[in-house]
Amino acid sequence: MAVTACQGLGFVVSLIGIAGIIAATCMDQWSTQDLYNNPVTAVFNYQGLWRSCVRESSGFTECRGYFTLLGLPAMLQAVRALMIVGIVLGAIGLLVSIFALKCIRIGSMEDSAKANMTLTSGIMFIVSGLCAIAGVSVFANMLVTNFWMSTANMYTGMGGMVQTVQTRYTFGAALFVGWVAGGLTLIGGVMMCIACRGLAPEETNYKAVSYHASGHSVAYKPGGFKASTGFGSNTKNKKIYDGGARTEDEVQSYPSKHDYV
């Protein structure tokens, strides 16, 4: 039961996380105009990974896409790539994990296969989450660098009374959405990996038991295989006894070979 819950929760958390990563990637507010010195502005600038926008005090909003590919900063391209890789891996992970869910039966799929799929999706979620966190962090670092650079030369003189005030940008909502979403996807992935260990019992998971037969002492070592005394009919190394109490999740888990915690 605990394994099913862990797997299901991991799936749901990852699903929310990946939805968040997609949302963050599509959002326009990766960076927003810094309003520290001027909380009320007639023209409010904000930028995303794909376009930059202006919200006028008139209430109108206008956005302009980045129609160039080569003209964009390498860092922005890198962030885009990280976010897209994160989304792709996350989407594949979700697809794999749906088939891996214990509560869903697909034909005669063995639990060992489900365990492997759960592990695979868990790893994909972890990498997806890390990609998103890395992408957002790279962008945030870029913002911090640019912020202090534009603060240092806030006014670039143009001679006489004319000044160009540089627009300073600070963290937008998308960054926080991305960090949280990446974290959730990462946590979901870890939960899937934990769940996968409990999906199938390992053959080395059974308690030792002793049988006292008349004349000979036959000891059964952990794993349920007969000791090499030359006695008994378990020559094919079949599992003959499970000394431990079985949880609900383990009831149908043999004859699987692997047991992931």
């Epitope: 502005t41 904000y46 930028q47 202006v54 006028e56 209430g59 206008e62 956005c63 302009r64 000044q163």
Partner: antibody, heavy 118, light 113 residues
């Protein structure tokens, strides 16, 4: 068609107050900010402030923060500007105007002349 | 506050000739988000309220004759009337729509020679 109709001319004594109205029609009143601009005789244009009819949110030129109060009556689609502590230098034509894209003022009222004289 | 300076203060042009009015801003009016310049041009005839001619520095308002053209970027802007007509006699104002408070130029009076 879009129309902004202002109240008639006013003559006031120094120290008095005046409330100028601007009735809007021909568009969705709550969707657009309304500006107030003044023009002293023979002078240029001076922006006073603007108000949003949906939430009565205002933006005031600091020069007029103790002079002008902008209010809205959505039931009659009317914007009001009250000018307090009038002085002779407040004698001007006061215009209301709708704010359009680019923070431009696309439709203007006919203007209200406020004369402050003792 | 952004200071808007127009030149010349007055301009006399013969009918059919080109008229050029300049407007200089004390700060850039270019918004980085949409790469538009928040500069507006108005025409005011005697006894009338101002009329919107051009916004975003170069976008003509509906119904404005195409002889009126706005140009420029950043801090330097121009309103050009390619062929002046008698009905163009008015005072022309530029306005900053980029930052509060919105400010106007002092106006340029256009007359017929």
């Amino acid at each position: 068609q879009v129309q902004l109709v202002q109240s008639g001319a006013e003559v006031k004594k120094p120290g008095a107050s005046v409330k100028v109205s601007c009735k809007a029609s021909g568009y969705t009143f709550t969707n657009y900010w309304v500006n107030w601009v003044r023009q002293a005789p023979g002078q240029g244009l001076e922006w006073i402030g603007m108000v949003h009819p949906s939430g009565s949110e205002t933006r005031l030129n600091q020069q007029f923060k103790d002079k002008a109060t902008l209010t809205v009556d959505t039931s009659t689609s009317t914007v009001y500007m009250e000018l307090s502590s009038l002085r002779s230098e407040d004698t001007a034509v006061y215009y209301c105007a709708r704010v359009w894209s680019g923070n431009a003022f696309d439709y203007w009222g006919q203007g209200t002349l406020v004369t402050v004289s003792s | 506050d952004i200071v808007m300076t127009q030149s010349p203060d007055s301009l006399a042009v013969s009918l059919g000739e080109r008229a050029t009015i300049n407007c200089l801003s004390s700060q850039s009016l270019l918004a980085s988000g949409n790469q538009r310049n928040y500069l507006t041009w108005y025409q005011q005839k005697p006894g009338q309220p101002p009329k919107l001619l051009i916004y975003w520095a170069s976008t003509r308002d509906s119904g404005v004759p195409d002889r009126f053209t706005g140009s420029g970027s950043g801090v330097d802007f121009t309103l050009t009337i390619s062929s002046v007509q008698a009905e163009d006699v008015a005072v022309y104002y530029c306005q900053n729509g980029f930052s509060f408070p919105f400010t106007f130029g002092q106006g340029t009076k256009l007359e017929i020679k």
